[in-house]
């Protein structure tokens, strides 16, 4: 009981339980593929506990393995019009430090309007994650539609 | 060591260890959208470890933050079969409390016969989740192609 | 303060942390459907801590639920060339020992070229998990596009 | 409630052709298969096809061979079957049916039928 | 084409007894965890009517005394206490592919 108590007084970050969830804020100018992200209990179900957001991009505060996940669910899509403006593709990758830039999850759109994966992976601190969302397709900003989230899962 | 000990001897319960997998018991009537859950040693690889199930809706026991998975495969079904459904939507979210309602996750088939996706969101004790399958076909109710589960992440 | 550094001396082994996340290796022989993976720090971010590979295929050392999850892309791929060569199906099941032989999780390809999914499993030390590939595609080898990983969530 | 309402018995002569029509009532005539069954005279059921309104697909029983022709009108929530180089054996009572919920091949509703009599 | 083979061709039952019909399907017609089997009655100059589905799912409006069991390629129609109005010609069918196929039907008398 005493231990369950000594748990409970632990600063959670001590645990290593750094978690992210993020909703979409917006895409990013014409030459910039990268999706920007938004999170916090004020924007709904989103929220950051130890990432942080800069400018838009996830950066990992913690060294460890890390379950990455997202789903994006295209706007005013049909299968139609996804077959019509395929390649349309998202990936998931390390964007800097640039000496540490590597894709790390690829998806294709084929003929259906919603990707969704995910991955184990090794993060370090000051890794920051992008999107890239190529094609000419808007991604939905419906919070249940795209969301794009990491988990700490051990060191 | 001896802590080692100790960690063992607590209920799995003190340290948060919620999870459930649950597969498909039924449709609901007519009118009513929601896809009815079963799970246990019985069952087969379906459990609950603190959640509960509330006539066939997932039911939390613990406040935190939980990783939400599903997947829904359509029987007997091609992709011919589900565009020309289109739109056969499956949504996860909070339907209990009222006050809480909200819509978690949400996909449509278009030509695919699978939806599967997963999210981090926080949940509190005493939200029911429920998962609305709009359309004209029936899920199939194989253990390894349709199921729904949560997995407590952290406080 | 203390509790920390205990924690961190212990070995994560026995908090039961055990999880891989493997890269294709190559697939079996013509009569052999199941995919061979590999993984290993020198292979790029692909890892076994705890799990082991046995000729390619993933036996697990330490019982407790698991999260499981998959991606697979085919090689050089469009979704006509997918649904012209359906049925392609993925399954991820315990093909050892015999006596625990099951499917775990299963989709087709349908119009889509690639598949990706996760679910919380019961296994057991000495579980082999094999993941069977059946059609005449190939999947591709790219790191961020076809991976296969388990996750130790609780006893 | 829906409702299928058939056209009216007919008398054809044989290697003409008959077209009979399925009137739903409803607003959900282009989401479901409207199906096609016949029975002869005290023999049993025999499904012949199906017609998909929302995008006019058909799915044929190959035992009529190319002689039955499905189609449907949206605007009319009206679905017809045409059965050509008719003969005496084609003489039957001829149903159209769907199902209420799920859009798969059992039939929860049934027009009251349709006689079609081939006689020379 | 899946064959649906009745039996027996016809079945004369007294009032308040059980009454089984069989219906074997050349191959199964189960899958995705359904068995896709359903039963119908039918009375003279009337359409079938659709008594039970997927295999046991009794229809709304249906009387209790009708079930349905079954899966793969055997199954059971009964009537647990015949009724005079259940006089009637009754037809398995499948819907597990295209095309479906209906069992050459059974006739269902009072002895």
């Known amino acids: 009981q005493r231990f369950a108590q000594a748990q409970q007084q632990l600063p959670l970050e001590s645990l290593g339980w750094d978690v992210a969830e993020l909703q979409l804020n917006h895409t990013g100018p014409q030459q910039d593929p990268r999706l920007y992200w938004q999170g916090g209990p004020a924007l709904g179900r989103s929220f950051l506990h130890g990432p942080e957001l800069d400018k838009g991009q996830l950066r990992i505060h913690r060294d460890g393995i890390y379950m990455v996940h997202i789903q994006v669910t295209l706007a005013i899509c049909s299968s139609t019009t996804a077959s019509r403006h395929h390649p349309t593709t998202l990936a998931v990758g390390i964007c800097s430090p640039a000496s540490r830039s590597i894709s790390l999850l690829r998806l294709s759109f084929h003929q259906g309007c919603t990707i969704a994966s995910q991955r184990l992976t090794p993060l370090a601190r000051g890794d920051t994650l992008c999107t890239n969302l190529t094609g000419t397709l808007l991604p939905s900003r419906n919070t249940d539609e795209t969301f794009f989230g990491v988990q700490w899962v051990r060191p | 060591q001896r802590f080692a000990q100790a960690q063992q001897q607590l209920p799995l319960e003190s340290l948060g260890w919620d999870v459930a997998e649950l597969q498909l018991n039924h449709t609901g009537p007519q009118q009513d959208p929601r896809l009815y859950w079963q799970g246990g040693p019985a069952l087969g690889r379906s459990f609950l470890h603190g959640p509960e199930l509330d006539k066939g809706q997932l039911r939390i026991h613990r406040d935190g933050i939980y990783m939400v998975h599903i997947q829904v495969t359509l029987a007997i079904c091609s992709s011919t079969t589900a565009s020309r459904h289109h739109p056969t939507t499956l949504a996860v979210g909070i339907c209990s409390p009222a006050s809480r309602s909200i819509s978690l996750l949400r996909l449509s088939f278009h030509q695919g016969c699978t939806i599967a996706s997963q999210r981090l969101t926080p949940l509190a004790r005493g939200d029911t989740l429920c998962t609305n399958l709009t359309g004209t076909l029936l899920p199939s109710r194989n253990t390894d192609e349709t199921f729904f589960g949560v997995q407590w992440v952290r406080p | 303060q203390r509790f920390a550094q205990a924690q961190q001396q212990l070995p994560l082994e026995s908090l039961g942390w055990d999880v891989a996340e493997l890269q294709l290796n190559h697939t079996g022989p013509q009569q052999d459907p199941r995919l061979y993976w590999q993984g290993g720090p020198a292979l790029g971010r692909s890892f076994l801590h705890g799990p082991e590979l046995d000729k390619g295929q993933l036996r697990i050392h330490r019982d407790g639920i698991y999260m499981v999850h998959i991606q697979v892309t085919l090689a050089i791929c469009s979704s006509t060339t997918a649904s012209r060569h359906h049925p392609t199906t993925l399954a991820v099941g315990i093909c050892s020992p015999a006596s625990r032989s099951i499917s775990l999780l299963r989709l087709s390809f349908h119009q889509g070229c690639t598949i990706a999914s996760q679910r919380l499993t019961p296994l057991a030390r000495g579980d082999t998990l094999c993941t069977n590939l059946t059609g005449t595609l190939l999947p591709s080898r790219n790191t961020d596009e076809t991976f296969f990983g388990v996750q130790w969530v609780r006893p | 409630e829906v409702q299928l309402v058939q056209s009216g018995a007919e008398v054809k002569k044989p290697g003409s052709s008959v077209k009979v029509s399925c009137k739903a009532s409803g607003d959900t005539f282009p989401r479901y298969n409207m199906h096609w069954v016949r029975q002869a005279p005290g023999q049993g059921l025999e499904w012949m096809g199906a017609i998909f309104p929302g995008t006019g697909e058909t799915s044929y029983n190959q035992n009529f061979k190319g002689r039955v022709t499905l189609t449907a009108d949206k605007s009319t929530s009206t679905a017809y079957m045409e059965l050509s180089s008719l003969r005496s054996e084609d003489t039957a009572v001829y149903y159209c049916a769907r199902n209420s919920y799920y859009d798969y091949a059992w039939f929860t509703y049934w027009g009251q039928g349709t006689l079609v009599t081939v006689s020379s | 084409d899946i064959v649906m083979t009745q039996s027996p061709d016809s079945l004369a039952v007294s009032l308040g007894e059980r009454a089984t019909i069989n219906c074997r399907a050349s191959?199964?017609?189960?899958?995705?965890?359904?068995?896709?089997m359903h039963w119908y009655q039918q009375k003279p100059g009337q359409p079938p009517k659709l008594l039970i589905s997927l295999a046991d799912n009794l229809e709304s409006g249906v009387p209790d005394r009708f079930s349905g069991s079954g899966s793969g390629t055997d199954f059971t129609l009964t009537i647990s206490s015949l009724q005079a109005e259940d006089v009637a010609v009754y037809y398995c069918?499948?819907?597990?592919?295209?095309?479906?196929?209906f069992g050459q039907g059974t006739k269902l008398e009072i002895k």
């Open positions: 069918q499948h819907s597990r592919e295209f095309p479906p196929t």
């Open positions: 191959k199964s017609v189960s899958s995705s965890g359904y068995s896709f």
